[in-house]
């Protein structure tokens, strides 16, 4: 048999091998499509199937538009006047070849080291499947779940049957402060055998945050308490989204729930130490802070201050 | 919305002619294969012409074939049957209807138009 | 040519019962036949197609279904407004052919 690729609209002519040029004929035509659900033989005379496919006077089978259920088989039988017989069979397939494809909402500008969208590629009215491929400074982009994931969407027309594919990229780019990247789309189509056709590229710039400031409060101002007391020790860490803040004692990771927050009530030479605040930034990573020495007074001879970083300021800034 | 309205029914006598027209609206006209049917009073339906939407093939089945003639004129969203030699058994209500191929079937049908052929 | 044997030609039925209607074609027509309602008077209007899909606008109590050449109509119950002649059409091959008719009566 032979295999023919028609294009989704456009007429198609199939030959009935060895059939006279013109009537009188001895043939038959018989299709199993998408719109049959076994062999279908063609009417000589024409009929309700015309607008589909219908036998020419030299005996060829027209099919005036091809659709998607038109894909399948089709055959001709035909007997000479000398009573050979000679049989035709076709596999069509049948293609259509979508619009350019575009990136949609593409991003003016990503943040380095955060996951951002960069656009969304849409490949519009094409049959059958094809893909859709992102590419970054002209390389294939492949996904890897981590710095490059894709989510792609596949939806159908119900009247056409034509396929619009959806693919979003998101990345995370790398700092570094060298040229911006360059991203495009590509479709490559499942039929036929044809060169992919690429988006215009976009090249959003990269935004480079500077280090998490973390900055450590205590209160009362200075660090040094009286027994009883009660201190209070604030983590400010600006950034979205808000970190994770924990809590170290002399280098020592504290059991505690994260908070901005740490109440020491009642305060006892036991709660003496060298404080820090760690904010975790899901993009960032962990940023300490200076450390606070939190004392206990415990008498008139006893230290009358905190010393904070070795300053004795009330609070002390990251840089 | 899709309307299909026939005109040119009437008392014609026995041998004599009648054209119907069916103007249609709603809908890409030159898109689709349209219909005549028919219902004698108190029968059921009985199909009487089909023709391709760009009017170069007509069909008709034995008992009209030769004296019956459907048409259409896209330009102006109309279909026509003119009726020839007609006998007493060719009194009936004529619906147009939209389709008549495969793809459609009849989807869509006019109110009808009544012809009585008697003497 | 094909014949549509429609079956059965009348029925009485009560609102709320489950009516079916049954046509057979003489010889395989693939998927292609319609079932239509005609109320006296007034034009056939289309319910199911290609032989079980439920055309725009019908109720869903009206269903087609198909076993090789025996296509069914079922109205699973009855409204005061179904009572009507309804018909089946076969239009896979020319002459396209109607079934003769079910008229379906209040009881």
């Known amino acids: 048999g032979q295999n023919i690729t028609a294009r989704i609209g456009e007429p198609l002519v199939l030959k009935c091998k060895g059939a006279p040029k013109k009537p009188p004929q001895q043939l038959e035509w018989k299709l199993n499509t998408g719109r049959t659900e076994a062999w279908k033989v063609l009417s000589p005379q024409g009929g309700s199937w015309d607008s589909v496919a219908h036998v020419l006077p030299n005996g060829s089978l027209l099919l005036p538009a091809v659709g998607i259920q038109d894909e399948g088989t089709f055959r001709c039988r035909t007997t000479n006047r000398n009573g050979k017989e000679t049989k035709s069979n076709y596999r069509v397939r049948v293609y259509q070849i979508p619009g350019k494809p575009e990136i949609l909402d593409p991003a003016s500008e990503l943040t380095a080291g955060i996951p951002s969208k960069v656009g969304t590629c849409v490949s519009d009215g094409g049959y059958p499947l094809g893909t859709l491929s992102w590419h970054m400074d002209g390389k294939l982009l492949v996904p890897d779940g981590k710095g490059v994931s894709v989510k792609e969407q596949t939806r159908r027309h119900p009247d056409t049957g034509l396929f619009t594919l959806q693919s979003e990229l998101m990345v995370t780019p790398a700092g570094g402060g060298g040229p911006p990247p360059t991203f495009s789309c590509s479709f490559s189509p499942g039929l036929p055998r044809r060169r992919a056709s690429y988006t215009a590229p976009i090249q959003p710039s990269v935004w480079e945050p500077g280090p998490l400031e973390v900055r450590l409060l205590v209160e009362p101002e200075g660090g040094a308490v009286a027994p009883g007391e009660t201190v209070t020790l604030t983590c400010e860490a600006p950034a979205q989204p808000p970190p994770q803040i924990h809590w170290m004692k002399d280098g020592m990771s504290l059991p505690l729930p994260p908070s901005p927050v740490l109440l020491l009530p009642e305060v006892g030479p036991q709660d003496e130490g060298t404080y820090s605040c760690v904010a975790t930034h899901p993009n960032r990573g962990p940023q300490e802070s200076l450390p606070i020495s939190i004392s206990v007074e415990t008498g008139e001879d006893g230290p009358t201050a905190g010393s904070e970083g070795g300053s004795g300021l009330g609070t002390l800034a990251l840089a | 919305e899709v309307q299909l309205v026939e005109s040119g029914g009437g008392l014609v006598q026995p041998g004599g002619s009648l054209r119907l027209s069916c103007a249609a609206s709603?809908?890409?006209?030159?898109?689709?294969?349209m219909t005549w049917v028919r219902q004698a009073p108190g029968k059921g339906l009985e199909w009487v012409a089909s023709?391709?939407?760009?009017?170069?093939?007509?069909y008709y089945p034995d008992s009209v074939k030769d004296r019956f003639t459907i048409s259409r004129d896209n330009a102006k969203n109309s279909l026509y049957l003119q009726m020839n030699s007609l006998r007493a058994e060719d009194t009936a209500v004529y619906y147009c209807?939209?389709?008549?191929?495969?793809?459609?079937?009849?989807?869509?049908w006019g109110q009808g138009t009544l012809v009585t052929v008697s003497s | 040519d094909i014949q549509m044997t429609q079956s059965p030609s009348s029925l009485s039925a009560s609102v709320g019962d489950r009516v079916t209607i049954t046509c057979r074609a003489s010889?395989?027509?693939?998927?292609?036949v319609n079932w239509f309602q005609q109320k006296p008077g007034k034009a056939p209007r289309r319910l199911i197609y290609?032989?079980?899909n439920l055309a725009d606008g019908v109720p869903s109590r009206f269903s087609g279904s198909r076993s090789g050449t025996d296509f069914t109509l079922t109205i699973s119950s009855l409204q005061p407004e179904d009572f009507a002649t309804y018909y089946c059409?076969?239009?896979?091959?020319?002459?396209?052919?109607f079934g003769g008719g079910t008229k379906v009566e209040i009881k």
């Open positions: 010889q395989d027509v693939g998927i292609y």
């Open positions: 290609r032989a079980t």
């Open positions: 709603g809908f890409t006209f030159n898109n689709y294969w």
């Open positions: 209807a939209r389709g008549g191929d495969i793809t459609t079937g009849f989807d869509y």
């Open positions: 059409l076969e239009f896979d091959e020319h002459p396209l052919t």
């Open positions: 023709i391709d939407n760009s009017g170069d093939n007509t």
